[in-house]
């Protein structure tokens, strides 16, 4: 019962985590304009992995996609890659873990196979969570570096007369969503790995003892039935199919009354 609960909880926690990773990846607020110690502007800038947006006091929000691959910073590309790898691994992990759930019966699948699949999905969740945490952390580090660089050059004067204020960016909501989601996916993965151990009890190996009686010979092996650890050659191979294709159409409402600064 505890194993089923641990496995089920691990699955739910990972599911929430992966949903969070997807949400964070799609969010536009990875970095937001720093308002502290800056002139109050009637325009608010924020940026995501895929596009940058400007919200005016008028309520109008304008978003522009990054329509170049080669022109983007390598770090941004790396963050994108980490988040996508995290999502793909998490999605495959979810599919594997659905079949591995103890409460779901699929044909005559043995506990050993379920244990194997539980461990596989657990490892996938752990790697997925780590990818998300790494991606968000790399982006955060990039922001911190740029923040202090732009603070050092906050005002670039033209003959001391005209001032150009550089827009500084700070942590956006997506970073916190990403960290929490990555953490949840990681925790879910660990729970799945713990559940795997419970699904596959240790195999009891006793030496076979032969009792010789007069007239006929009987070989007696104690144990009645054999519990497999799930790592033997008897594990059945299941092919997992992942639809994997996901498209998202972004519709910009203009101007939205919810967009006021």
């Amino acid at each position: 019962m505890a194993v089923t609960a641990c496995q089920g909880l691990g699955f739910v926690v990972s599911l929430i985590g992966i949903a969070g990773i997807i949400a964070a990846t799609c969010m536009d607020q990875w970095s937001t304009q720093d308002l502290y110690n800056n002139p109050v502007t009637a325009v608010f800038n924020y940026q995501g992995l895929w596009r940058s947006c400007v919200r005016e006091s008028s309520g109008f929000t304008e978003c522009r996609g990054y329509f170049t691959l080669l022109g983007l910073p390598a770090m941004l590309q790396a963050v994108r890659a980490l988040m996508i790898v995290g999502i793909v691994l998490g999605a495959i992990g979810l599919l594997v873990s659905i079949f591995a759930l103890k409460c779901i019966r699929i044909g005559s699948m043995e506990d050993s196979a379920k244990a194997n699949m539980t461990l596989t999905s657990g490892i996938m969740f752990i790697v997925s969570g780590l990818c998300a945490i790494a991606g968000v952390s790399v982006f955060a580090n990039m922001l911190v570096t740029n923040f202090w660089m732009s603070t050092a050059n906050m005002y670039t004067g033209m003959g001391g007369m005209v001032q150009t204020v550089q827009t500084r960016y700070t942590f956006g909501a997506a970073l916190f969503v990403g960290w929490v989601a990555g953490g949840l996916t990681l925790i879910g993965g660990v729970m799945m790995c713990i559940a795997c151990r419970g699904l596959a009890p240790e195999e009891t190996n006793y030496k076979a003892v032969s009792y010789h009686a007069s007239g006929h010979s009987v070989a007696y092996k104690p144990g009645g039935f054999k519990a497999s650890t799930g790592f033997g050659s008897n594990t059945k191979n299941k092919k997992i199919y992942d639809g994997g294709a996901r498209t998202e159409d972004e519709v910009q409402s203009y101007p939205s009354k919810h967009d006021y600064v």
Epitope: T41, A42, V43, N45, V54, S58, E62, T167
Partner: antibody, heavy 118, light 113 residues
Framework: EVQLVQSGSELKKPGASVKVSCKAS????????INWVRQAPGQGLEWMGW????????TYAEEFKGRFVFSLDTSVSTAYLQISSLKAEDTAVYFC???????????WGQGTLVTVSS | DIVMTQSPDSLAVSLGERATINCKSS????????????LAWYQQKPGQPPKLLIY???TRESGVPDRFSGSGSGTDFTLTISSLQAEDVAVYYC?????????FGGGTKVEIK
């Protein structure tokens, strides 16, 4: 057609109060901010501040904090400017203007002349 | 506050001639997020409210004749009337829409020579 119609001219004594109205029509009132702009006789334009009809949030220019209050009645799509403790230097034409995307004032009221004289 | 300096204060131009008004901001009005300059130009005739001509420094408002054009970026901006007409006699104001408080230039009076 977007229209902002302001109340008529006012003649007030120093120390009195005045409330100027700005009725909007031709668009969804709560979707766009209403700005107030002052123009003293023979002078230029001075931005006083604005009110967000969706949230009711107000932003005032430093010079207009205190005696100047922006308010709304969304049920009749009307914005108000109230000036208390009137002074002679408050004599001006007061305009309301809609804040449209690009942070531009695309539609203006016809203006309300407030004269403060003893 | 951002100071908007307009020049000249007044301008007399012959009908059909080009009129050029300059506006200088004490800080850049270019927003890095969308590469737009938050500057608008307004025309005000006596006894009338101001009328929007140009926004985002160079985008003409619908219904505005194409003889009016705006240019410039950062801190220096220009309003050009390519061929002055009698109905263009007015005071022209530039206004920055990037920083609070929003501020207007002092105005340029355009007259016919």
């Amino acid at each position: 057609e977007v229209q902002l119609v302001q109340s008529g001219s006012e003649l007030k004594k120093p120390g009195a109060s005045v409330k100027v109205s700005c009725k909007a029509s031709g668009y969804t009132f709560t979707n766009y901010g209403i700005n107030w702009v002052r123009q003293a006789p023979g002078q230029g334009l001075e931005w006083m501040g604005w009110i967000n009809p969706y949230t009711g949030e107000t932003t005032y220019a430093e010079e207009f904090k205190g005696r100047f209050v922006f308010s709304l009645d969304t049920s009749v799509s009307t914005a108000y400017l109230q000036i208390s403790s009137l002074k002679a230097e408050d004599t001006a034409v007061y305009f309301c203007a809609r804040l449209y995307y690009g942070n531009r004032f695309d539609s203006w009221g016809q203006g309300t002349l407030v004269t403060v004289s003893s | 506050d951002i100071v908007m300096t307009q020049s000249p204060d007044s301008l007399a131009v012959s009908l059909g001639e080009r009129a050029t008004i300059n506006c200088k901001s004490s800080q850049s009005l270019l927003n890095s997020g969308n590469q737009r300059n938050y500057l608008a130009w307004y025309q005000q005739k006596p006894g009338q409210p101001p009328k929007l001509l140009i926004y985002w420094a160079s985008t003409r408002e619908s219904g505005v004749p194409d003889r009016f054009s705006g240019s410039g970026s950062g801190t220096d901006f220009t309003l050009t009337i390519s061929s002055l007409q009698a109905e263009d006699v007015a005071v022209y104001y530039c206004q920055q829409a990037y920083y609070y408080p929003l501020t207007f230039g002092g105005g340029t009076k355009v007259e016919i020579k």
